[in-house]
């Protein structure tokens, strides 16, 4: 699989994807904020 995330539980895999999505959204917001502040 693409980024080295490995788990034997499908629900755990889905949770990892949800966390990744959340972090991407948070980091994306921070990045946009930094650009705006510049």
């Amino acid at each position: 699989h693409s980024d080295g995330i490995f788990t034997d539980s499908y629900s755990r895999y889905r949770k990892q994807m949800a966390v990744k999505k959340y972090l991407a959204a948070v980091l994306g917001k921070r990045y946009k904020q930094r650009v705006k502040n510049k």
């Epitope: 693409s2 788990t7 889905r14 990744k20």
Partner: antibody, heavy 117, light 112 residues
């Protein structure tokens, strides 16, 4: 209501590859877990793998590791399953399916792939 | 991989009678999140499978209440309380708890 429409039947030679498409409508494609399942004639169902389009993250069944590639094009809400080094045992109907509650709630109509010399 | 064993392979039942299909997994399907991802599919000839029951006992919307699912851990049952002509199909159990996701071999339900 989610709808999955798959590409048409294919006839392939042993050793070649096949690429089947699955176009989704009526849902959030990027945030769906798209699976591929196959069914040989008169046989049961076999899970091949999945993709989570938002991150293009794939998981493949051990049996197909190295021979299957699942991709997704978010711009067209289409998933693809490519199977290489085809042999006669790969003759099957290939289905895409979208997960809800770790259960396949929506299925494509199926694509028959025939491998014959 | 988790092995899903269905029994019987085929079943002939009179209209209005009860049909019972068993499904056994080689390992518990209870996940760490407290849910059990055991599902049942119905497949009619020439059609894709259709979700019937998920999370052991939750009926898909539109599925008649004569269909019910039960069980826990490794042992599960699909019951059709009063068989109708339109229930003739192959039924599959499958598990979505562990990778690789795996299916039972199917049970063909016919009318006696």
């Amino acid at each position: 209501e989610v709808q999955l429409v798959q590409s048409g039947a294919e006839v392939k030679k042993p050793g070649s590859s096949v690429k089947v498409s699955c176009k989704a409508s009526g849902g959030t494609f990027s945030d769906s877990y798209m699976h591929w399942v196959r069914q040989a004639p008169g046989q049961g169902l076999e899970w091949m793998g999945l993709i989570y389009p938002i991150f293009a993250d794939q998981r493949y069944a051990q049996k197909f590791q190295g021979r299957v590639t699942i991709t997704a094009d978010e711009s067209t809400s289409t998933a693809y399953m490519e199977l290489s080094s085809l042999r006669s045992e790969d003759t099957a109907v290939y289905y895409c399916a979208i997960d809800q509650d770790a259960s396949f709630a929506y299925w494509g109509q199926g694509t028959l792939v025939t491998v014959s010399s | 991989d988790i092995v899903m064993t269905q029994s019987p392979d085929s079943l002939a039942v009179s209209l209005g009678e009860r049909a019972t299909i068993n499904c056994k997994s080689s390992q518990s399907l209870l996940d760490s999140d407290g849910k059990t991802y055991l599902n049942w599919l119905q497949q009619k000839p020439g059609q894709p499978p259709k979700r019937l029951i998920y999370l052991v006992s939750t009926r898909e919307s539109g599925v008649p209440d004569r269909f019910s699912g039960s069980g826990s851990g490794t042992d599960f049952t699909l019951t059709i309380s009063s068989l109708q002509a339109e229930d003739v199909a192959v039924y599959y159990c499958w598990q979505g708890t562990w990778f690789d996701l795996t299916f039972g071999g199917g049970t063909k339900v016919e009318i006696k």
